[in-house]
Interface confidence: medium
């Protein structure tokens, strides 16, 4: 069971300082942006991180949403990352959900975060380069200290 607590507005960056945004095709991508670019591209660069209490505490349970033309929430259904047109729900009556991730700080690096899927244990949000695009994907942690699954989260409230 997950029960919604509060929400924060955040900018999410990978460890190369690229900013996560949602493109016109609703794809989550990373791109080099100055602070000014980041502001100019709002609301596509500002994410609503909603925190949930977890009946089985396993880290901070969160959803990641964006408010563009509609509210869309990040999902890892079938291990494929996409934004689904839906609100972060008030309650989820299950111990796993495609939209719930466990946000945890990287041991020894309090400012670096990882997001583990609640549906797929051991799978994390990651940044992966595909041709010219830097994409947000779901990836199994295969090595300790994998930088691709580490992010910084800057509160904008």
């Amino acid at each position: 069971y997950f029960g919604k607590l509060e929400s924060k507005l955040s900018v999410i960056r990978n460890l190369n300082d690229q900013v996560l945004f949602i493109d016109q095709g609703n794809r989550p991508l990373f791109e080099d942006m100055t602070d000014s670019d980041c502001r100019d591209n709002a609301p596509r660069t500002i994410f609503i991180i909603s925190m949930y209490k977890d009946s089985q505490p396993r880290g901070m349970a969160v959803t990641i949403s964006v408010k563009c033309e509609k509210i869309s929430t990040l999902s890892c259904e079938n291990k494929i990352i996409s934004f689904k047109e839906m609100n972060p729900p008030d309650n989820i009556k299950d111990t796993k959900s495609d939209i719930i991730f466990f946000q945890r700080s990287v041991p020894g690096h309090d400012n670096k975060m990882q997001f583990e899927s609640s549906s797929y244990e051991g799978y994390f949000l990651a940044c992966e380069k595909e041709r010219d695009l830097f994409k947000l994907i779901l990836k199994k942690e295969d090595e300790l200290g994998d930088r691709s699954i580490m992010f910084t989260v800057q509160n904008e409230d």
């Epitope: 929400s7 609301p43 408010k67 047109e85």
Partner: antibody
Framework: QVQLQQSGPRLVKPSQTLSLTCTVS??????????WSWIRQPAGKGLEWIGS???????YYNPSLKSRVTISGDTPKNQFSLKLSSVTAADTAVYYC?????????????????WGRGTLVTVSS | DIVMTQSPSTLSASVGDRVTITCRAS??????LAWYQQKPGRAPKVLIY???TLESGVPSRFSGSGSGTDFTLTISSLQPEDFATYYC?????????FGQGTKLEIK
């Protein structure tokens, strides 16, 4: 049809705490889908959002007032309340309570669709 | 905070006129904008939300348009009851902020 009725003292002394209550009829503050908000308007000036409370108890405050504001809900009485501490003459305004449709996929979100009639609160010794 | 700037501050018009009020946001807010009408001594009343969606019960002479940073409220044919002050409000992210208001008065 939801209606909001405001109550509370209209005169508050400087440095004291302003307290107002909004009673909701025709709907429940404990059902999801809405925030319950406070907005103020100094005489002859524009509107300023103070803060909102969700049925779950989550609160959202204007950063410019956050250190002085508390919004709370009383589900059995179907009321929500505003407390603003350490008031000065600059806090003299008409205070409104309002209902706010929450984040919603169909986009009815984060505006103020039902308002109380407003209470003029004067801060003066 | 997102700053909302309305123009003009005051607008003089006559019954039957078509009038337009503009609102500019300090950053892109997509379509997350609402318009309100306020008469003296009364609470504001929402007219339009999501930039162009007419609130239930609001006359069709009111319309809204725009996206990003620039928005307009249009009254196609002014009626005597439309003389009031109009406010825009961004509904993208808190803190929710309002424009300073446009007073629509009789010419």
């Amino acid at each position: 049809q939801v209606q909001l009725q405001q109550s509370g003292p209209r005169l508050v002394k400087p440095s004291q705490t302003l307290s107002l209550t909004c009673t909701v009829s025709g709907g429940s503050i404990s059902s999801g889908g809405y925030y319950w908000s406070w907005i103020r308007q100094p005489a002859g000036k524009g509107l300023e959002w103070i803060g909102s409370i969700y049925y779950s108890g989550s609160t959202y405050y204007n950063p410019s007032l956050k250190s002085r504001v508390t919004i709370s809900g009383d589900t059995p009485k179907n009321q929500f309340s505003l407390k603003l501490s350490s008031v000065t003459a600059a806090d003299t305004a008409v205070y409104y309570c309002a209902r706010t449709p929450a984040y919603d996929g169909d986009a009815r979100a984060d505006f103020f669709d039902v308002w109380g009639r407003g209470t003029l609160v004067t801060v003066s010794s | 905070d997102i700053v909302m700037t309305q123009s003009p501050s005051t607008l003089s018009a006559s019954v039957g006129d078509r009038v337009t009020i503009t609102c500019r946001a300090s950053q892109g807010i997509s379509s997350w904008l609402a318009w309100y009408q306020q008469k003296p001594g009364r609470a504001p009343k929402v007219l339009i939300y999501k930039a162009s969606t007419l609130e239930s019960g609001v006359p069709s002479r009111f319309s809204g348009s725009g996206s990003g940073t620039d928005f307009t409220l249009t009254i196609s044919s002014l009626q005597p009851e439309d003389f009031a002050t109009y406010y825009c409000q961004q509904s993208l992210y808190p803190p929710w902020t309002f424009g300073q208001g446009t007073k629509l008065e009789i010419k």
